[in-house]
């Protein structure tokens, strides 16, 4: 039975040209995360996270995505092309899988300034 | 005694092909993540492939990429690399090897198998 | 891809000396670092894992530490099955990558 649940930032915005974190966070369960995947809006992967491998960052995305802080992601550079869906998938045993969205909306500099509730500290 | 023996290396020319084998045993194959490393001659390690547990996924050096494919019959114990489009560079002798739970280390290869590419 | 450089490339050492072998890396690869030994004509063999954990069967006088990008394997008194390469390996970022080798040589 999967008792867990996922946390998100939710929705959330930034500016063109600077980061943001993706963050998901698994709770209510005991369950061995054995890899988190990392995916855009059109379900190419960004990055993977292997409890026995490491990270491995997609070739198309090594130049502005970091690993980290913890499962999260960095997306740095950012562009009006990324808005949209990002899905964290939690591989766990002996649970199975969970899934987290995240909605991230790229502002014009202006725009964002007055966004900043909508960023993570 | 867990044991890993490595197979199918040889002499070849380039643009050719080559499939290498990895046979186990002595520990429950299926349940560990496995690896190719190469060492060209006089030279230090390089990292070359991965296979999941069962199969499901792989990934490779940039190096290898497109000609090699890591793949694995865990029915016979026994690990598999395809080398295709083969260059000089890829001359070297082939380890596979199996990590320590949750240590990202590899700590049993095998003795290794020869691959030349020459014309 | 995470590059390791170890220093010194090759080192003359005596039996019973206390040789230190360094491994940095070009980011930070919090402790999944691993160190080898390599003698001529054999597979390497796991010494250290963790960064610092010794590998079972290993020898006490083995010991490494470091975290971040900064990392040593210290032997405390070097014996004569010692002499031999010695590499590190970073786990953090796939692909795993290897320093280039230290050789431990007899002086």
């Known amino acids: 039975m999967m008792t867990g649940t996922i946390e998100t930032t939710g929705n959330i915005s930034a500016k063109k040209g600077g980061s943001v974190i993706l963050q998901c966070h698994l709770s209510s369960t005991m369950a061995q995360v054995t890899q988190v995947n990392w995916e855009q809006h059109d379900h190419s992967l960004l990055a993977i996270r292997n409890a026995e491998l490491g990270w491995h960052i997609y070739p198309a995305f090594k130049d502005r995505v970091a690993p980290g802080p913890g499962l999260g992601l960095t997306l740095q550079s950012l562009t009006m092309n990324d808005t949209g869906e990002y899905f964290c998938t939690y591989h766990t045993y002996p649970d199975g899988t969970y899934r987290g969205r995240i909605f991230l909306e790229v502002l014009e500099s202006s725009v964002a300034e007055h966004s900043a509730r909508f960023q993570i500290p | 005694e867990v044991q890993l023996v490595e197979s199918g290396g040889g002499v070849v020319q380039p643009g050719r092909s080559l499939r290498l084998s990895c046979a186990a045993s002595?520990?429950?194959?299926?349940?560990?993540?496995m690896h190719w490393v190469r060492q060209a001659p006089g030279k230090g390690l390089e990292w070359v492939a991965v296979?999941?547990?069962?199969?499901?996924?792989?990934l490779y050096a940039d190096s290898v990429k497109g000609r090699f494919t890591i793949s694995r019959d865990n029915s016979k114990n026994t690990l598999y690399l395809q080398m295709n489009s083969l260059r000089a560079e890829d001359t070297a002798l082939y380890y596979c090897?199996?990590?320590?739970?949750?240590?990202?280390?590899?700590?049993?290869w095998g003795q290794g198998t020869m691959v030349t590419v020459s014309s | 891809d995470i590059q390791l450089t170890q220093s010194p490339s090759s080192v003359s050492a005596s039996v019973g000396d206390r040789v230190t072998i360094t491994c940095r890396a070009s980011?930070?690869?919090?402790?999944?670092l691993a160190w080898y030994q390599q003698k001529p004509g054999k597979a390497p063999k796991l010494l250290i894992y963790?960064?610092?954990s010794l590998q079972s069967g290993v020898p006490s006088r083995f010991s490494g530490s470091g975290s971040g990008t900064d990392f040593t394997l210290t032997i405390s008194s070097l014996q004569p099955e010692d002499f031999a390469t010695y590499y590190c390996?970073?786990?953090?970022?796939?692909?795993?990558?290897f320093g280039g080798g230290t050789k431990v040589e007899i002086k």
């Open positions: 090897a199996k990590p320590v739970p949750k240590s990202r280390a590899l700590d049993v």
């Open positions: 002595g520990f429950t194959f299926g349940s560990y993540y």
């Open positions: 296979i999941w547990p069962d199969g499901s996924n792989k």
């Open positions: 980011q930070g690869i919090s402790s999944w």
């Open positions: 963790g960064a610092s």
């Open positions: 390996q970073q786990a953090f970022y796939l692909p795993w990558t």
